[in-house]
């Protein structure tokens, strides 16, 4: 059965997933899909790294973590109910059927009704005053110049402080980690 | 293996729009990466345009954000550069680059050199 | 922006020499930093990335070091295949680039 992992709605949801590289920098291919793990690959493809880097990507969807040292966990930004669901981490590991494949159920519940707003800090995963917004076709990147200058240096550090520090306790429990090589 | 070669005139003049195709080898633009615009001026330095995700999102060089806009032709695995309002500091050998989600790049085209002047 | 300054613009070395070329970022950047050799007339090659995890297919006598504001790229032993002119390159925020490195023969 899956592990469970919660977050509220419009905060980063945190979905823990680690593996040992045999040496430092030499990744192996990991994938994050939407839906249990199938067979092969990852199923709705959220997020994809190979060798080298993350080579696939979608909104809200980034690795927080040191990916070169194995830390793949996934942060979902800014999260809605229709992020709930079981999600894919898929270590490639090279041979055949050699995958490690971890199903993650997330549920997300609403937001508590709060007296009085509390100050949010944003930020935006892209470049400086880069903000990606959707719509029905292609993503399109708009400039806006009253965002604040945040780096992807410090997009880690606000990611390591919005991170449910809970969460990091169920993951060691859960044994969502294997050691390749 | 993948390949980028660009193509486009070689010439244009002041005030004019100057458009570059890059067209990709060996790999859909769609499966993923971000497909980035870099030019090298006749002193050698480098500057980073832009780029079109393998999603269509953008992200464009703020002191060029006014100026560029960079598209894909997916039926033809192509993405393109248009850079408004040139001057003849714009002249500059072009190259089109394939790059990670943190744009560096591995893959480079040999580079198309534009010169603008009247 | 963040600024990149590279240093020294250009040296002269011998083959067999081992070579050091810094480069200094004017903010934080974390280790995302990438290096390029580029020769003339040809598109620049991918080094480094990451700081210090070699491309695949770069010899191991090119290594690179650093995080924070100070990198460094090195060549163990200069062969003649390597006089070139090497950039530095940051992508922490919006990527920039160093002046580069030309490395002549002595």
């Known amino acids: 059965s899956e592990v469970e992992y919660r977050a509220e709605v419009g905060q980063n949801a945190y979905l823990p997933c680690f593996y040992t590289p045999a040496a430092p920098g030499n990744l192996v291919p990991v994938c994050w899909g939407k839906g249990a793990c199938p067979v092969f690959e990852c199923g709705n493809v959220v997020l994809r790294t190979d060798e080298r880097d993350v080579n696939y990507w979608t909104s809200r969807y980034w690795l927080n973590g040191d990916f070169r040292k194995g830390d793949v966990s996934l942060t979902i930004e800014n999260v809605t109910l229709a992020d709930s669901g079981i999600y894919c981490c898929r270590i490639q590991i090279p041979g055949i059927m050699n995958d490690e494949k971890f199903n993650l159920k997330l549920v997300i519940k609403p937001a508590k009704v709060t007296p009085a707003p509390t100050r949010q800090r944003d930020f935006t995963a892209a470049f400086p005053r880069m903000l990606t917004t959707r719509g029905h076709g292609p993503a399109e990147t708009q400039t806006l110049g009253s965002l604040p200058d945040i780096n992807l240096t410090q997009i880690s550090t606000l990611a390591n402080e919005l991170r449910d520090s809970r969460l990091a306790n169920d993951l060691r429990d859960s044994g969502a980690t294997i050691r390749i090589g | 293996q993948v390949q980028l070669q660009e193509s486009g005139p070689g010439l244009v003049k002041p005030s004019q729009t100057l458009s570059l195709t890059c067209t990709v080898s060996?790999?859909?633009?769609?499966?993923?990466?971000?497909w980035n615009w870099i030019r090298q001026f006749p002193g050698n330095g480098l500057e980073w345009m832009g780029y079109i995700s393998h999603s269509g999102s953008t992200s464009y060089n703020p002191s060029l954000k006014s100026r560029v806009t960079i598209s894909v032709d997916t039926s033809k695995n192509q993405f393109s550069l248009k850079l408004s309002s040139v001057t003849a500091a714009d002249t500059a050998v072009y190259y089109c680059?394939?790059?990670?989600?943190?744009?560096?790049?591995?893959?480079w085209g040999q580079g198309t050199t534009v010169t603008v002047s009247s | 922006d963040i600024q990149m300054t590279q240093s020294p613009s250009s040296l002269s070395a011998s083959v067999g020499d081992r070579v050091t070329i810094t480069c200094k970022a004017s903010q934080n950047v974390g280790a995302n930093v990438a290096w390029y050799q580029q020769k003339p007339g040809k598109a620049p090659k991918s080094l480094i990335y990451s700081a210090s995890y070699r491309y695949s297919g770069v010899p191991s006598r090119f290594s690179g070091s650093g995080s924070g504001t100070d990198f460094t790229l090195t060549i163990s032993s200069l062969q003649p295949e390597d006089f070139a002119t090497y950039y530095c390159?940051?992508?922490?925020?919006?990527?920039?680039f160093g002046g580069g490195t030309k490395v002549e023969i002595k």
């Open positions: 680059a394939r790059g990670y989600r943190s744009p560096w790049f591995a893959y």
């Open positions: 060996g790999y859909s633009i769609t499966s993923g990466f971000a």
């Open positions: 390159q940051q992508y922490n925020s919006y990527p920039t």
